[in-house]
Interface confidence: low
């Protein structure tokens, strides 16, 4: 079941999935100047058995020299700074770091991606949130969110982070120092 | 140590069919991708298409797709390629590859099969 | 669909001489991964992600390139290293037609 709207917005703050839910899915999109081959596949699918997961299908883009696109915006894989970078055009995923059971990994870029992961995300999928460059967490508790089915109907539920610029001194009483990212995550993984 | 071993040359007539295996020792067969290679006479290399062991998901290149088909078998850590309606352009060796990225996450062919050659003739 | 052309198709070099094999890409790439081939074997990794070199590959070789120009130099040439290489595109598998570096 696929949930109907985007992970809640926190101010000063960005989400990242660290594992994608089998049945997620993440559209082939493409940078200015460059579009989907013709019989592409629209979309990567989070596919797979009981003890494997990994991404089906492969997105592709080849130039649009002869046609215009429109919404398309996009640096090169090495330029996706805020991404982390397993790259590979069809849908490989790196294998070497633990795997939660009916998850895959960040799926790989392919060459001319555009900047911007549109994820599908379906009920069950968590992301966790932290704050951007230049703020700090001040936590009241779970910096994450979870897509849940409620009476029939998806939401997400409510992150319990306030992100606070460097400057500002304000401290809810006996908090710890705040770490950089949950589970001392890299705080170059960030949006999605 | 790693190593893929590739089963023993092939004499097959046009028009039939032939399966090539591809066994993996010395690492977790389940958690790389094997990536199958054609390479004709005094030709180059050109790549096939990639299975990945753990739920058998398979990626083609386009001009492979109506020629082979992958397989494994997890228990006994082998992966198989399947090539039907052989023609004479089919003669050929065959490698198998298994894929491993670095640290910037480049995928490429670090560990590469013995090769099974194909020879199509009547 | 990424073509990748290799010059040139015979390398002649003599030992001790500096050589450049070149591949070229139909579109600007991120990457690309060099494999050495010799007669009757396998292909070997040799230079992965532009230019790192695989375990084992002597430091004589060198790899570098951006956009749609790469290439391997070996700064010595040795008689070990007469081979078949083989440029890839690492988004799409894609090979080129190789080099053959043969001694003199």
């Known amino acids: 079941e696929l949930c109907d709207d985007d992970p809640p917005e926190i101010p000063h703050a960005t989400f990242k999935a660290m594992a994608y839910k089998e049945g997620t899915m993440l559209n082939c999109e493409c940078k200015r100047g460059f579009r989907r081959i013709k019989s592409g596949s629209l979309y990567m699918l989070c596919t797979g058995n009981s003890s494997h997961s990994s991404w089906d299908n492969q997105c592709q883009c080849t130039s649009s020299a002869t046609r215009n696109t429109t919404k398309q915006v996009t640096p090169q894989p090495e330029e996706q700074k805020e991404r982390k970078t397993t790259e590979m055009q069809s849908p490989m995923q790196p294998v070497d770091q633990a795997s939660l059971p009916g998850h895959c990994r960040e799926p790989p870029p392919w060459e001319n991606e555009a900047t911007e992961r549109i994820y599908h995300f379906v009920v069950g999928q968590m992301v966790y949130y932290q704050c951007v460059q230049g703020y700090r967490a001040l936590h009241r508790g779970p910096a994450e969110s979870v897509c849940k089915m409620t009476h029939g109907k998806t939401r997400w539920t409510q992150p319990q982070l306030i992100c606070t610029g460097e400057m500002e001194t304000s401290q809810f009483p006996g908090e710890e120092k705040p770490q950089a990212s949950p589970e001392g995550r890299p705080e170059s993984e960030t949006s999605c | 140590q790693v190593r893929l071993q590739q089963s023993g040359p092939e004499l097959v007539k046009p028009g039939a069919s032939v399966q090539m295996s591809c066994k993996a020792s010395g690492y977790t067969f389940t958690d790389y991708y094997i990536n199958w290679v054609k390479q004709r006479p005094g030709q180059g290399l050109e790549w096939i298409a990639w299975i990945f062991p753990g739920n058998g998901n398979t990626y083609f290149n386009e001009n492979f797709k109506d020629k082979a088909t992958l397989s494994v078998d997890k228990f006994s850590s082998t992966a198989f390629m399947l090539l039907s309606s052989l023609t004479s352009e089919d003669s050929a060796v065959y490698f198998c590859?298994?894929?491993?990225?670095?640290?910037?996450?480049?995928?490429?062919?670090?560990?590469w099969g013995t090769g099974t050659t194909v020879t199509v003739s009547s | 669909q990424i073509v990748l052309s290799q010059s040139p198709a015979i390398l002649s070099a003599s030992p001790g001489e500096k050589v450049t094999m070149t591949c070229r890409a139909s579109?600007?790439?991120?990457?690309i991964h060099w494999y050495q081939q010799k007669p009757g074997s396998s292909p070997k990794p040799w230079i992965y992600?532009?230019?790192n070199l695989a375990s084992g590959v002597p430091g004589r070789f060198s790899g570098s390139g951006s956009g749609t120009s790469y290439s391997l130099t070996v700064s010595r040439v040795e008689a070990e290293d007469a081979a078949t290489y083989y440029c890839q595109h690492w988004n799409s598998f894609t090979f080129g037609g190789g080099t053959e570096l043969e001694l003199k």
């Open positions: 579109s600007s790439v991120s990457h």
């Open positions: 590859a298994r894929a491993t990225y670095d640290h910037g996450g480049y995928w490429y062919f670090d560990v």
């Open positions: 992600a532009t230019s």
